[in-house]
Interface confidence: low
Amino acid sequence: EVEKTACPSGKKAREIDESLIFYKKWELEACVDAALLATQMDRVNAIPFTYEQLDVLKHKLDELYPQGYPESVIQHLGYLFLKMSPEDIRKWNVTSLETLKALLEVNKGHEMSPQVATLIDRFVKGRGQLDKDTLDTLTAFYPGYLCSLSPEELSSVPPSSIWAVRPQDLDTCDPRQLDVLYPKARLAFQNMNGSEYFVKIQSFLGGAPTEDLKALSQQNVSMDLATFMKLRTDAVLPLTVAEVQKLLGPHVEGLKAEERHRPVRDWILRQRQDDLDTLGLGLQG
């Protein structure tokens, strides 16, 4: 909290400009009019203020807008956004996608912070729905955000957004989410050649149906066991021993280590013992 002191003669700020970087904290508090700051927020980011000075500017805005900042100010917060707490952000009503993009840009390259999570929450509440443009924006900045959405919300994700998704971004998706994402990924990657296609589609295969797994088994893909273990049990069960052998390639011997776990356990129980014996792994149906 900065003490209330009178502004020294001749120091009253007429506009937000570089001269303010030489002001002490108490001078900023005393000499910068909050309304002036609010109307010239777009200039703040071009000025190399210290974090301490930014604290003073935030304090001035908080006093001017105790119920929460208007969107005209929020859109131009820039690096001042990093000073906001989730509690501050909960007071906002953000409806413009441009505002959302501007603030996400400030946080770009970092893990999603509580501030950003709260901002997105407020934005979606303000809009009343997760439309295609919003999802496009969110998945562009945070591909991992896909897995925080319900299957219903995911249904409006455009296939074009799938290109930004990295394998680790799907770690937290459950099977129902992958059921929705897989057909979109298939559509997104449909023009790729076999080996490149498999590299891209691999992370989404937890949503693949049996017929797609059968098709993959004809393409020498050498699926690893970690991917196989994430496949839908109902999609794996109809596969023959020969198809699983082709699908896994040299990784087939890993089935022995996973024989007590789904979907391997359930698949083994569906096979004829004679067929299992051809693998030479000692699997017992």
């Epitope: 989730p86 709260t118 997105i120 929450d121 991992g144 955000y145 897995c147 959405l149 937290t172």
Partner: nanobody, 126 residues
Framework: QVHLVESGGGSVQAGGSLRLSCAAS????????MGWFRQAPGKEREAVAG????????YYADSVKDRFTISQDNAKNTVFLQMNSLKPEDTAMYYC???????????????????WGQGTQVTVSS
Amino acid sequence: QVHLVESGGGSVQAGGSLRLSCAASGDMNGYKCMGWFRQAPGKEREAVAGIYTGRNTTYYADSVKDRFTISQDNAKNTVFLQMNSLKPEDTAMYYCASKYCAVVAEFGGPRLVRYWGQGTQVTVSS
């Protein structure tokens, strides 16, 4: 379906401590974040602390940082909230929550919570 059962609430003097537990049963596949929200009378439900199960990355609300600690017992699908230096403003109904999240910071904000516990009351008197 995931079922969450909380325990450990109660009444305590300001400055005291309590430890909440939340036991989860059912198919936890995909519900990677677990933790605690609270709701005081007449106020919105707010995130208190969350943990990304299996990774031990944590989220804390500013108001409880350095006082509350969230931890987990993966084998038992249980999450704990150790609450120290309790203040009267911590008085609320505390709810265990389970949700999808890509990073633990997303724990803040109740919109994406898929499952809630029934809640356990914490009362801190001055």
